[in-house]
């Protein structure tokens, strides 16, 4: 009878993570008597995967009927494959003895595991930035195999080109991670904008994974201020408004100062939203000019999103004859000693 040969017909097998891998092995003879064992890797550090003779291998089942001696098929199925199972598997025939001695090994079957990348996670800068500034976004995805992967960046559907990508580790590994950093220039219109990281991999069957970041979490659009004096509502009263326009986010505190003294502080609440996602707000101050003998300097001071305050002032002139009031015009002082100032917002 010819000497036993161990045949592993498949040089390589590729399996998706979570599936079962079938590793084929047949022998050409019933002798010598002794067990078949499967190992991952070669040499002294090889890992025992299955031993026909003994042991508990819960993930391994024999493919063929192993209770018949004439069976020469020692193929195994390994369930619930993970990237950690990747490697070269050897079917090895042993000769019975004390100890069992290796008689012949198959040529090996390389098992590669196709593992999907995790959902990309996009993160932006820790602090908000203002338009015209360049900010960095990072995208990370892990656990994929094989190593080949494609990553693209988009802003509102437009592909970005200013980014750097690394896949780790550089050498052989059971699975890989990708890390990419993209630079994005902010504009005042970016409140509604999205930055998208798109990952394409063989395991995704042409349906890439996407991670998004809303620029609303990154951008700060500082407000523009305009202080105007409205026509007289009633005898001796002047309505001064502070228009706070095109700001984001909403967190805003406004303080009215009269000749440098705090008159009233309020927090933006009932704001109106613009199409571009920024907000407008108006605060008004009703000044009883009869309470003033001298000119009044009214200042609208705005602290937006914890930033240093910006302000706009308006000189309210107290003159001898009342007239139609326009922006930055004076109102007649009636001579009243009362200092009545009323305020509101909208």
């Amino acid at each position: 009878e010819e000497e036993l040969q161990v045949i592993q017909p498949d040089k390589s097998v590729s399996v998706a993570a979570g599936e079962s891998a079938i590793l084929h092995c047949t022998v050409t003879s019933l002798i010598p008597v002794g067990p078949i064992q499967w190992f991952r890797g070669a040499g002294p550090a090889r890992e025992l995967i299955y031993n026909q003779k003994e042991g508990h291998f819960p993930r391994v089942t024999t493919v063929s009927e192993s209770t018949k001696r004439e069976n020469m098929d020692f193929s195994i199925s390994i369930s619930n494959i993970t990237p950690a199972d990747a490697g070269t598997y050897y079917c090895v025939k042993f000769r019975k003895g004390s100890p069992d001695t290796e008689f012949k090994s198959g040529a090996g079957t390389e098992l590669s595991v196709r593992a999907k990348p995790s959902a990309p996670v996009v993160s932006g800068p820790a602090a908000r930035a203002t338009p015209q500034h360049t900010v960095s976004f990072t995208c990370e995805s892990h656990g994929f195999s094989p190593r080949d992967i494609t990553l693209k960046w988009f802003k509102n559907g437009n592909e970005l080109s200013d980014f750097q990508t690394n896949v780790d580790p550089v050498g052989e590994s059971v699975s890989y991670s990708i890390h990419s950093t993209a630079k994005v220039v902010l504009t005042r219109e970016d409140v509604h904008s999205q930055v998208i990281c798109e990952v394409a991999h063989v395991t995704l069957q042409g349906d890439p994974l996407r991670g998004t970041a809303n620029l609303s979490e990154t951008i700060r659009v500082p407000p523009t201020l305009e202080v105007t004096q409205q026509p007289v509502r009633a005898e001796n009263q002047v309505n001064v408004t502070c228009q706070v326009r095109k700001f984001y986010p909403q967190r805003l505190q406004l303080t009215w100062l009269e000749n440098g003294n705090v008159s009233r502080t309020e927090t933006a609440s009932t704001v109106t939203e613009n199409k571009d996602g920024t907000y407008n707000w108006m605060s008004w101050l009703l000044v009883n000019v009869s309470a003033h003998r001298d000119d009044v300097k009214l200042t609208c001071q705005v602290e937006h999103d914890g930033q240093p305050a910006v302000s706009k002032s308006h000189d309210l002139k107290v003159s001898a004859h009342p007239k139609e009031q326009g922006s930055n015009t004076a109102a007649e002082n009636t001579g009243s000693n009362e200092r009545n100032i009323y305020g509101g917002s909208g």
Epitope: E1, L30, I31, V33, G34, P35, I36, Q52, K53, E54, S66, T67, K68, R69, E70, N71, K96, G97, S98, P99, D100
Partner: antibody
């Protein structure tokens, strides 16, 4: 059903010969190592002989040169030709199948009695 | 030849008892050790192979252990049908050899 049935035992005089047969059913005998084991009255078990799948044969020291193990694949049968029998060969002879990969005994026949006496 | 020595040669026990029989080989036999049960007038029955693996249909109250030269057969809770003679056997190399047997009797 996997089964082994021995036959051919009986009374024989010292120096005589006997041929034991073992008919296998439910499996292909040629695919297994096959054995003969005996048990003298009131004694323990003693392995006698074996034949491997390649036709290689093995014997315990006391029967070497006197006993011959063989098989006939067409009849799915195992044989033990016993010559120059001695009183010490008196025993129940069992036909036994070796295990799938390690030759551990798994299937036993019911046995056949061989008595060597004058 | 490899000598197999069983102990004890006989053992008295009661129904429900847990009993252990030992078998020692004169040289290392790896774990190529089998256990058999034989009742009077009957053919032996295979219980255990490779020291600890149960043959198909053998109840789990039987268990085997050991490797190298020292082996044990344990019956966890004796039932009336378990009173019989038990043999160990090495099958690592020819000639295969048996222990002399342990007769398990009802106390």
């Amino acid at each position: 059903e996997v089964q082994l049935v021995e036959s051919g035992g009986g009374l024989v005089q010292p120096g005589g010969s006997l041929r034991l047969s073992c008919a296998a059913s439910g499996f292909t005998l040629s695919s297994y190592d096959m054995h003969w084991v005996r048990q003298a009255p009131g004694k323990g078990l003693e392995w006698v002989s074996a034949i491997g799948t390649a036709g290689d044969t093995y014997y315990t020291g006391s029967v070497k040169g006197r006993f011959t193990i063989s098989r006939e694949n067409a009849k799915n049968s195992l044989y033990l030709q016993m010559n120059s029998l001695r009183a010490a060969d008196t025993a129940v002879y069992y036909c036994v199948r070796g295990g799938v990969w390690d030759d551990a005994f798994d299937i036993w026949g019911q046995g056949t009695m061989v008595t060597v006496s004058s | 030849d490899i000598q197999m020595t069983q102990s004890p040669s006989s053992l008295s026990a009661s129904v429900g008892d847990r009993v252990t029989i030992t078998c020692r080989a004169s040289q290392d036999i790896n774990n190529y050790l089998a256990w058999f049960q034989q009742k009077p007038g009957k053919a032996p029955k295979s219980l255990i192979y490779t020291a600890s693996s149960l043959h198909s249909g053998v109840p789990s109250k039987f268990s085997g252990s050991g490797s190298g030269t020292d082996f044990t057969l344990t019956i966890s809770s004796l039932q009336p049908e378990d009173f019989a003679t038990y043999y160990c056997q090495q099958y690592v190399s020819y000639p295969y050899t048996f222990g002399q047997g342990t007769k398990l009797e009802i106390k």
